[in-house]
């Protein structure tokens, strides 16, 4: 299993990840957004809310 | 594969405005940075400043705040770095470089001739 | 703003000589360092990030090092292809170029 370098972003990346933790991965030389729940996108910018259907009446 | 393709070189007169373009292709912008660098002939490398497509916010150099404007098109992927009240000094090589989802890539560079 | 002063701004070594180049920063720049290399008539060329993180296809002869405020980018053995000027890049708090340091061969 290759490892995976990672530490975290410069301030030069301040307010990269909107909503979610900004990861720098130094060997892909790239950030990466770690998103908070709710929220996912490559700078987390998009939020989403899970719907829960009720049972159907089969099911009950 | 991704690209960043800017517009052509400019001739401009001292006291002149000139605006750079700066086209994406292979990447959204909006998940990216887009920084401007410049080179004037036999010079060193300076960063100008950078902008947030994704809400358009910027940063710019003290030297160059009032004078320069980085802007984004995020409709057609398009970042642009306009510079007011062009000197002789400002003849130079302006290049777009995308940062954040990877390291910095650079465009080709737009040479602008500012002469009388 | 933070600064970067890089030394020597130019240098004339033989080939196969051991070529160093130093960048110190105004603060300390937490390894946030990248150093890029430039021929004539073309765009920079990036070659190490993070201080001593090589890009793909770079060769290995090239290698960085520092941390706090020195940093230092090193050729071990020149080659006639490494002329050109080659710069450092903090981008810790925003961004800085070093001034440069062009390198010829003797």
């Known amino acids: 299993v290759a490892q995976v370098s990672i530490t975290k972003c410069s301030s030069d990346m301040n307010g990269y990840c909107l909503h979610g933790q900004c990861i720098y991965l130094v060997d892909m030389s790239q950030n990466y957004c770690r998103c908070e729940v709710g929220y996912t996108g490559v700078r987390c910018e998009h939020f989403f809310l899970t719907v829960h259907q009720p049972l159907s009446k089969e099911y009950v | 594969q991704d690209q960043l393709v800017q517009s052509g070189a400019e001739v401009k007169k001292p006291g002149a405005s000139v605006k750079v373009s700066c086209k994406a292709s292979g990447f959204n912008i909006k998940a990216t940075y887009i920084q401007w660098v410049r080179q004037a002939p036999g010079q060193g490398l300076e960063w100008m400043g950078r902008?947030?497509?994704?809400?358009?916010?910027?940063k710019y150099v003290p030297k160059f705040q009032g004078r320069v404007t980085i802007t984004a098109d995020t409709s057609t992927n398009t970042a642009y770095m306009e510079l007011s009240s062009l000197r002789s000094e400002d003849t130079a090589v302006y290049y777009c470089v995308r940062s954040g989802t990877l390291f910095d890539f650079w465009g080709q560079g737009t040479l602008v001739t500012v002469s009388s | 703003d933070i600064q970067m002063t890089q030394s020597p701004s130019s240098l004339s070594a033989s080939v196969g000589d051991r070529v160093t180049i130093t960048c110190k920063a105004s603060q300390d720049i937490h390894k946030y360092i990248a150093w890029y290399q430039q021929k004539p008539g073309q765009a920079p060329r990036l070659l190490i990030q993070?201080?001593?993180t090589l890009q793909p296809g770079v060769p290995s002869r090239f290698s960085g090092s520092g941390s706090g405020t020195d940093y230092t980018f090193t050729i071990s053995s020149l080659q006639p292809e490494d002329i050109a000027t080659y710069y450092c890049?903090?981008?810790?708090?925003?961004?800085?170029f070093g001034g440069g340091t062009k390198v010829e061969i003797k």
């Open positions: 902008i947030d497509p994704l809400n358009g916010n910027t």
């Open positions: 890049l903090q981008y810790d708090n925003l961004r800085t």
């Open positions: 993070y201080t001593s």
